[in-house]
């Protein structure tokens, strides 16, 4: 009803047409620069109400110093110059990280306000003759249905439980312990892993496409934008949670291999079959070797049974196998698998998902491998609660079901997970995990024990502060009598100087006022935020404390419901926006009911098609009907009639 | 499929009155909730009154209350609307809709409008 609709998923979009040939410049200049991290890419572009000036360089940290990359039996040390991480310049907190191709930035931008995702056009819109090349849209237009079907997303309690089974019949192979494990001072032993084990953080990883994904994405460089942007963004979730003490969890990757559509024919190519189920496909990744690295990945572009996203072999701290650093060993079927792995398809019921449902289709399936099952109990599926303080915040990552996304709680781990994970890490991450990386002076990023941070001597054009060049104990720091440098935000002159109180540092946004200096500080400060239950979004949503966050309901004292299907409700009304009084479901009735004429007058606000409904138990298709999803359906009784369980299994292969 | 034929719009003065009727095409109606929206140049469509099918229970907008009085005739399938006391911020095109039995219903059927201008 509201909007510029990009597909079944993204409900607003707005186009991008900034120079593609000079962007295109820079980054090959940036590519020939001495040091490969020397140089600033800059991009400047307005959308969706704000400018962007974003402040870019090459992101070294995600790939590992022997990083290969493997495709149609060549190995390439390849080159990522094209891989960029940054931020917007000026605005303290944000983020940005993507790939530049063909003069084309595609990736995601975090800011105060929420995550842009910019994408390519032509990945949604065929006409040739568009005014614009890429699209750019902010996570709120999402409308992210993260798992759909009974488990949404990750397929069913079954199939997990036929997983289980087989993980306790591993045969471990029998290996010399070192010498100094022997050792009789038990206590100082662990003393000094504790010690070495505080640095081993980084989770190094193995991701292989098959060749529907490169054909979806067309090119290696796509391909490889695709893969950094998913890493780096689990990298950001698993980085910020605290398991149990165990912090800055981080991943790198070590080797990738792209099945390209060469391969499609190749037969030593385990992925080249049009039509694999989502176990049979988890079984090929996991057949193959993967000792060296802490997880393996397959991405896929298939469109799975029951709205599966994502598989994964759950980790455990002992008496099971699989997950995090898991080695290859012999199985009750005869054959030796890595355990290891997971695999993440970009396709579900025929679309693409944006790239902010894979990035959490991810984050699940990892946190499968780090040891957490699905959430469940009161206390880690708020989402479910009748008490509508906790249902409010949502579900977290490990939710097994549908999720909107958009809640407070689904980016973030719940205890139950958290308890899971750190046990698992307590016991495993020595066995795998290598040390990270420090901050980087010269990356035009102030860190931690950084004053500033103005680049190589070649790029910084600031009188204020030590370039990254100079000696230790002054790289990065102001020189002496200076008051603060650019570097450390837009608050600060050329001259070294804290601007003057009045100067306006960011513009208005939807839901919040200009940013203004305050001649105290180089940052700019907090913007005032807009009056809450100010309309955002076009319409479609309220600013509550300068985001564009709440419901439309909420502009009303009303709450956001689920329009569940009872007392005679017409099936139509659970694809609508519906609302009720404050801790009353009995209220909950469609925007467009003759309850709500008065907030409303009669428009019916829907839900994007792909969203959940009915508390959850299916999905709104294109016709605004919500399908339920059965998960014993037709199909999977037929099989089950025809086919005894063992027969199957050798057809299967 | 119901159909809805509003009528009884013009230029009135302000302060002068005016009666709207809707009739709609079939008898299912003597059940449902009907009622008045209105929409002015450039603005977004607004509530107006509704009112149940036995005719027991009504709303009105606040920025019409105790000046517009809305009632049905279940006999001759018609809506009604009286206006008294216009203002010139009430010019708009007033449209009849017809929504389901349960106050949780949903708008369905709308009627295709007419033209109430007040003139200061």
């Known amino acids: 009803q509201y909007g510029n609709p990009l597909n079944k998923y993204i409900r607003h979009y707005e186009g991008l047409s900034y120079n593609v040939d000079s962007l295109h410049q820079k980054h090959q200049r940036a590519k020939r620069a001495v040091s490969h991290e020397d140089q600033f890419l800059r991009l400047d572009f307005h959308a969706h109400g704000r400018h962007f000036n974003l402040r870019m360089k090459r992101d070294t940290s995600l790939f590992s110093d022997e990083f290969k990359v493997e495709t149609s039996n060549k190995v390439l040390d390849y080159d990522t110059s094209h891989i960029y991480t940054g931020h917007i310049y000026g605005e303290e907190g944000s983020f940005s990280h993507g790939s530049v191709i063909d003069g084309r930035f595609e990736g995601f931008i975090q800011t105060r306000g929420g995550t842009f995702y910019v994408e390519p056009a032509e990945r949604y819109i065929k006409d040739r003759t568009l005014p614009f090349h890429s699209v750019i849209y902010h996570e709120d237009d999402i409308n992210y249905p993260h798992k759909y079907g009974p488990q949404g997303g990750c397929a069913d309690h079954s199939v997990f439980e036929r997983m289980r089974k087989y993980q306790m019949t591993g045969v471990e192979e029998v290996t010399q312990i070192p010498q100094e494990e022997h050792a009789a001072n038990g206590p100082e032993l662990l003393r000094k892993k504790r010690t070495t084990s505080a640095e081993k953080n980084t989770c190094q990883l193995y991701i292989q496409t098959d060749h529907l994904f490169f054909k979806y994405y067309g090119t290696r460089e796509a391909v490889i934008a695709q893969i950094s942007s998913h890493v780096k963004a689990i990298d950001t979730i698993y980085q910020t949670t605290d398991f149990s003490g165990i912090r800055n969890i981080s991943f790198m990757v070590k080797r990738i291999r792209i099945n390209t559509t060469a391969d499609e024919k190749d037969p030593t190519n385990p992925f080249r079959f049009p039509n694999i189920g989502v176990e049979k496909f988890l079984e090929l990744n996991s057949e193959q070797n993967h000792d060296d690295y802490c997880l393996a990945y397959v991405f896929t572009d298939r469109d799975f049974d029951d709205g599966v996203l994502g598989l994964a072999w759950v980790g455990a701290p002992s008496g099971s196998s699989g997950g995090i650093c898991e080695k290859s060993k012999l199985y009750s079927d005869g054959k030796k698998k890595s355990l290891n792995t997971g695999i993440i398809t970009v396709q579900n019921y025929g679309s693409h998902v944006p790239p902010k449902v894979s990035h959490i289709t991810f984050a699940h399936e990892v946190g499968h491998n780090f040891g957490s099952p699905h959430d469940s109990g009161t206390e880690c599926t708020p989402g479910e609660s009748k008490n509508l303080g906790q249902k409010e915040n949502g579900n977290y990552i490990m939710y097994a079901r549908a999720t909107s996304g958009d809640k407070l709680n689904n980016n973030k781990f719940s205890l139950c997970s958290i308890r899971n994970i750190s046990q698992v890490l307590e016991k495993k991450r020595n066995n795998c995990f290598v040390e990270s990386g420090q901050p980087i002076c010269g990356n035009g990023m102030v860190e931690q024990g950084e004053e500033c941070d103005c680049g190589y001597s070649d790029q910084c054009k600031d009188e204020c502060c030590f370039d990254a060049n100079q000696p230790e104990g002054r790289k990065c720091k102001l020189k002496p009598g200076k008051q603060c440098s650019p570097s450390q935000g837009p608050c600060c002159t050329a001259q070294c100087a804290f601007k003057s109180k009045s100067e306006k540092c960011r513009d208005d946004s939807d839901c919040a006022r200009e940013g203004i200096c305050n001649g105290f500080t180089a940052l700019c400060p907090a913007s005032d935020p807009k009056p809450n239950f100010t309309d955002c979004n076009r319409h479609t949503q309220v600013c509550i404390n300068g985001q564009c966050a709440g419901s439309i309901c909420e502009k009303y004292g009303l709450e956001e419901c689920t329009c569940a299907s009872s007392d005679g409700k017409d099936d139509k009304e659970l694809c609508h926006v519906c609302c009720m009084k404050k801790m009353d479901p009995s209220t909950c009735a469609s925007t467009g009911s003759v309850q709500w004429s008065r907030h409303f007058s009669g428009r019916t606000i829907t839900l994007q098609p792909g969203s959940p409904c009915n508390d959850f138990r299916g999905y709104c298709d294109v016709f605004m009907r919500c399908r339920l999803v059965d998960a014993d359906g037709p199909l999977a009784r037929l099989k089950k009639a025809i086919f005894s369980p063992e027969l199957y299994e050798n057809i299967a292969e | 499929e119901v159909q809805l034929v509003e009528s009884g719009g013009g230029l009135v003065q302000a302060g002068g009155s005016l009666r709207l009727s809707c009739a709609a095409s079939e008898r299912i109606f003597s059940t449902y909730f009907m009622g008045w929206f209105r929409q002015a140049p450039g603005k977004e469509r607004e509530f107006v009154a509704f009112?149940?099918?036995?005719?027991?229970?009504?709303d009105y907008a606040d920025s019409v209350k105790g000046r517009f009085a809305i009632s049905r005739d279940n006999v001759k399938n018609t809506l009604y609307l009286q206006m008294s006391s216009l203002k010139p911020d009430d010019t708009a095109v007033y449209y009849c809709a017809v929504a389901g039995r349960q106050i949780k219903s949903t708008w369905d059927y709308w009627g295709q409008g007419t033209q109430v201008t007040v003139s200061s």
């Open positions: 009112i149940s099918g036995n005719g027991g229970s009504t």
